[in-house]
């Protein structure tokens, strides 16, 4: 049969099963893409949004790799990527996404690699991705790139439904902690990139989760702002015995100032001001629990006093009601006098 036509502004190769529409100022996905396409590069254009049906089978039944980076995309709408039965790789990097619909991929997608480098700088897109992942639409995902997004925190439970995930890239963000991030479901995770963030310490809970991931062999923690106080003691101990961390010898303190530049692996307990055996967070936790108990007791006593004085309170309430009624009747009488023009003089000369 004759080879399929190539959309006017694009470059196509049937042998390479590839279509490239690069820097062509396109405002929409070409509707006449050839059916042989497995690799589709639509990059450096001005798409703005990706609506439902912009990319759809049956014509794109073979599409396996889709690069939509740098297209000024603001919205990926519901169903936009749902009808692509062979889609394995998707790159949405470099788009200022404001909306990423949780239904963008439909109910389930065969997608294995998702790159969102620099595409989640707006909260709406991040929350959309979290919903999308939690809904289980991307259960086949093995690589997730979330680098360069200025992320401070990850939404709770965001990584909970990714049983096939092997590589997670969170580098070059502003992550300050991982307390609300659960890694437990990531049983196949092999590499985790957390370099170039603002992490100050890794807590015991996180370290325990990482220890429990049998496949996790590569953790990158370089260029973070490690705070070398008592709270980092457990992390240092873990670093010394772990073979999971890449270039751990180069990890160094950022704070406090007197510790800046010191290698984490060379820190001693004596330098970390760990005089008290209980770490600060657990002391705080104990204080909060105690405070809670005191407040509960006060509340209980208050309710008990109210209960014991219920008759007196009832009598007091009746008195207040009667007083209010007398007061209101006085107002009512004065209002009626003022309203009758014949009684105006009386009203002004009398003290009702």
């Amino acid at each position: 049969q004759p080879p399929a036509a190539c959309p006017a502004p694009c470059e196509c190769s049937e042998a390479a099963k590839t279509v490239k529409c690069v820097n062509k100022n396109l405002t929409e996905v070409p509707p006449d893409l050839p059916p042989y396409v497995r690799n589709l590069f639509i990059t450096g254009n001005r798409l703005g949004r990706l609506p439902a049906g912009a990319l759809s089978a049956p014509r794109l039944a073979e599409l396996g790799s889709l690069n939509l980076s740098g297209n000024h995309l603001r919205a990926v709408e519901a169903g936009a990527l749902a009808a692509l039965p062979a889609l394995r790789q998707l790159d949405l990097g470099g788009n200022p996404l404001a909306e990423l619909s949780p239904l963008a991929f439909g109910r389930a997608s065969p997608l294995e690699e998702l790159a969102l480098r620099g595409a989640l700088r707006e909260q709406g897109a991040l929350l959309g991705l979290a919903d999308l992942l939690q809904a289980g639409a991307l259960r086949n995902l093995s690589r997730l790139e979330l680098a360069d997004n200025g992320l401070l925190l990850l939404p709770t439970g965001m990584l909970g439904a990714l049983p096939a995930l092997r590589h997670l890239d969170l580098s070059n963000n502003s992550l300050v902690g991982l307390r609300n991030v659960s890694f437990q479901g990531l049983v196949r995770l092999q590499s985790l990139n957390l370099s170039d963030n603002s992490l100050g310490v890794l807590r015991n809970g996180t370290l325990a989760q990482w220890r429990g991931l049998p496949a996790l062999r590569r953790i990158s923690l370089s260029h973070n702002t490690w705070v070398c106080d008592c709270a980092i003691e457990d992390m240092v101990a873990w670093l010394k015995e772990s073979d999971q961390v890449e270039g751990k010898e180069a990890l160094s303190c950022a704070f406090p100032e007197k510790m800046a530049g010191r290698a984490l692996l060379k820190l001693n307990t004596s330098e970390l001001n760990c005089s008290a055996p209980v770490d600060v967070p657990s002391q705080l936790q104990t204080s909060y629990v105690f405070l809670g108990i005191v407040l509960a007791l006060i509340g209980a006593i208050f309710l008990l006093v109210l209960y014991l004085n219920r008759k007196g309170i009832k009598k007091w309430m009746h008195n207040i009601r009667d007083a209010c009624r007398d007061h209101m009747e006085g107002y009512h009488y004065r209002y009626e006098i003022n309203a009758d023009p014949r009684l105006t003089n009386l009203s002004s000369n009398s003290d009702v």
Epitope: P3, E11, S13, A15, A16, K17, T18, Y36, N39, A86
Partner: antibody, heavy 125, light 107 residues
């Protein structure tokens, strides 16, 4: 290891037919697109024909259109080239060559990445 | 059909020389070009794809460049095992077509 072994070549008279076979081992044949390429004595390479992994797409060079037919039997891991109405100018070494694209591959196209050792076809009266 | 023209058709060079082979397409083929090496009585071997990407296992002295209609294969320092015939091939569209070949011989 990955291997392509051509057979079926020989001397044949003009106007006659010949069927070449290419037996495949070491990879999942049913997932790969395949080609036949030939080389006339002392000359360069000439692409002859292509077939997709499932046989749904076939392309031929103008010089063999209507005379040569490519086919495959995925259950037997074998590629075929049926050559009819042979001419003297069809005399060449015929190579089967695997396309780097497999059914599940969606990265770069590496060209024809695995070649057989070739089988010689001589068309002479 | 797209015609591929290679030059020179043959050249003589010494071990250690820098060798450049050019290939011209009769119409624009973007970067859809491959280079093959063939030694006498042997099957061709893929060297370069997408005009400039080195096939896995191929020595780094081989490099490719070009886009559109003009392409170049360069061997930075010729080695004894590099004496062979080199072919370019376009895969922009069917029918696939090869250049006429460049034979690199020992001076």
């Amino acid at each position: 290891q990955v291997q392509l072994v051509e057979s079926g070549g020989g001397v044949v008279q003009p106007g006659r037919s010949l069927r070449l076979s290419c037996a495949v081992s070491g990879f999942t044949f049913s997932s790969y697109d395949m080609n036949w390429v030939r080389q006339a004595p002392g000359k360069g390479l000439e692409w002859v024909t292509f077939i997709s992994y499932d046989g749904s797409n076939k392309y031929n060079a103008d010089s063999v259109k209507g005379r040569f037919t490519i086919s495959r039997d995925n259950s037997k891991n074998t590629l075929y080239l049926q050559m009819n109405s042979l001419r003297a100018e069809d005399t060449a070494v015929y190579y089967c060559a695997r396309d780097s694209y497999s059914r599940s591959w969606y990265g770069d196209y590496y060209g024809m990445d695995v070649w057989g050792q070739g089988t010689t076809v001589t068309v002479s009266s | 059909d797209i015609q591929m023209t290679q030059s020179p058709s043959s050249l003589s060079a010494s071990v250690g020389d820098r060798v450049t082979i050019t290939c011209r397409a009769s119409q624009g083929i973007s970067s859809w070009l491959a280079w093959y090496q063939q030694k006498p009585e042997k099957a061709p071997k893929s060297l370069i794809y997408a005009a400039s990407s080195l096939q896995s296992g191929v020595p780094s002295r081989f490099s490719g460049s070009g886009s559109g209609t003009d392409f170049t294969l360069t061997i930075s320092s010729l080695q004894p095992e590099d004496f062979a015939t080199y072919y370019c091939q376009q895969y922009n569209s069917y029918p696939l077509t090869f250049g006429g070949g460049t034979k690199v011989e020992i001076k």
